[in-house]
Interface confidence: medium
């Protein structure tokens, strides 16, 4: 199809299911997270064809936007991905699920902002604790995919400098309470948990206190199960190549897939002068496929040695898993060897490369 092809992403119901039609679900994600929205069929019946719409405009599948009939994934989210999302019946545009998505900086993954919120001399003689960056603390609900890093921050000040401690679901929270431990960064007023799992879900409270008083803030963490999707191929790979006759060429294809991917390299060929069959499917020959002793790494590279003019043409990296297939293509142009060019030049011929 020329446009809007649905990528059918199937699998478990998401951890954050869609709200009832007419209700709007509020979701907050961190910058760099994967936004995952799920809209199961009402009453468990057949869904029918759907479209996903953001701020009234239809979403077109891309490397970053994975569109399925019941699920939408936006990878590596940024502020621009904030907005009103809806899953609609394709024909009538009837809204099946409605979400309000906000992508914010903090709490964020990683430690790129360390050092910004260290204790500072505020010039106050004495005083109870107070929040120094309240605008960074308005994100009360954090929904992140499993395996991500989560950081909760409670930047504060006071005189004397207050202490900070953390509670999970109202109880003291220490590193031994979770596999992988936690990182307490008192200078940055932060709690960091790497590679979160569903058991990390819960309410996290920072308690900031000194002898003049105590303040606290509670965040809710929801950990989304990773949703299966078809393989993702790195943009720009394989790349078009130009090679001289007799030289060696390598095409590269980088595949990302949760489910075990199956990689093949194909070359497009002509049959009876046609590149496609009666059903529109291109004619191809399989150059490389998984064998007993081939690794995924080996399959991500296609090597052509001592290329001939017959090697010129279109090559495709095809990656599939239990969910679906993805493919990227590139072209190989084979030029005559230099000495041939020189001879031709002397004979007065011109080659357009």
């Amino acid at each position: 199809e020329s446009l809007g092809t649905e990528q059918r992403v199937v699998g478990r119901a998401a951890e954050v299911p869609g709200p009832e039609p007419g209700q709007q679900e509020q979701l907050v994600f961190g910058s760099g997270d994967a936004v995952e929205l799920s809209c199961p069929p009402p009453g468990g019946g057949p869904m029918g064809p759907t479209v996903w719409v953001k701020d009234g405009t239809g979403l077109v599948p891309s490397e970053r936007v994975l569109v399925g009939p019941q699920r939408l994934q936006v990878l590596n989210a940024s502020h621009e991905d904030s907005g009103a999302y809806s899953c609609r019946q394709r024909l009538t545009q009837r809204v099946l699920c409605h979400f309000s998505v906000r992508v914010t900086d903090a709490p964020s993954s990683g430690d790129d902002e360390d050092g910004e919120d260290e204790a500072e001399d505020t010039g106050v003689d004495t005083g109870a604790p107070y929040w120094t960056r309240p605008e960074r603390m308005d994100k009360k609900l954090l929904a992140v995919p499993a395996a991500n890093t989560v950081r909760f921050r409670c930047p504060a000040a006071g005189n004397p400098t207050p202490s900070i401690s953390w509670l999970k679901n109202g109880r003291e929270f220490r590193g031994e309470h979770r596999i992988g431990g936690i990182k307490l960064r008192h200078q940055q007023w932060s709690l960091v948990m790497e590679s979160v799992v569903p058991s990390d879900r819960g309410n996290y409270t920072c308690v900031v206190e000194n002898k003049f008083g105590s303040i606290r803030q509670t965040y809710t963490l929801d950990v989304l199960e990773r949703s299966p999707h078809r393989p993702i191929l790195q943009a720009g790979l394989p790349a078009n190549q130009t090679a001289v006759l007799g030289s060696d060429v390598e095409f590269h294809c980088k595949v990302y897939s949760d489910a075990q991917p199956h990689i093949q390299w194909l070359k497009h060929v002509e049959v009876n002068g046609s590149k496609v069959g009666p059903d529109g499917t291109p004619y191809v020959t399989v150059l490389k496929t998984a064998g007993a002793n081939t690794t995924d790494k080996e399959l991500e590279v296609l090597s052509l040695h001592n290329v001939t003019f017959e090697d010129a043409g279109e090559y495709t990296c095809l990656a599939g898993n239990s969910i679906g297939f993805s493919h990227h293509s590139a072209w190989l142009v084979v030029l005559p060897a230099e000495e041939e060019l020189v001879e031709a030049d002397e004979a007065g011929s011109v080659y357009a490369g």
């Epitope: 057949p46 029918g48 479209v51």
Partner: antibody
Amino acid sequence: EVQLLESGGGLVQPGGSLRLSCAASGFTFSDYDMSWVRQAPGKGLEWVSAISSSDGSTYYADSVKGRFTISRDNSKNTLYLQMNSLRAEDTAVYYCAKHLPNFDYWGQGTLVTVSS
Amino acid sequence: QSVLTQLPSASGTPGQRVTISCTGSSSNIGNNTVSWYQQLPGTAPKLLIYYDSHRPSGVPDRFSGSKSGTSASLAISGLRSEDEADYYCGTWDDSLNGYVFGGGTKLTVL
């Protein structure tokens, strides 16, 4: 290549009936919602009817409700429009169109003339 | 009388930029995605813009669509003589439970 080919148009008297067909090829017909759109001579486009791919739900413009019936035969890759109680104002070129949810492909149309 | 309102005509000279507008309501443009269709004389309509602002492959980037509130616009830059055609906007209308088109705008290239 996506192709939609309408047939069944012609001259019919007021009150008469016609059945239009649209033969589809080049795509998985059963996966897509389909519509009929008409255009009276020298006038603009008017949506007539649509049929869902998932459950066969049908939708009609008020101007044809109760007189026209849209249907599909997925095994034959064909869309139909049964037109009864035809009126002079139904005179138009009738196009079948594929939905996504816009009309991304159109047939060339078949002319229906309602005249005594 | 069309549910979506378009000016009946528009014109421009080659190389110019012209904008064709389409006004609706919250039950159609305000809540649903807009498409634009080009109909050259004597031919079937052709999809020009879908999902408010996306171009199908093969449509030149001289054509662009936008939407704000209950109005949509089609802009054609670098106008060419072959752009002379009728242009229609369309979207689903929740109240009518049907697809609606604008009355069409006839573009003349002077």
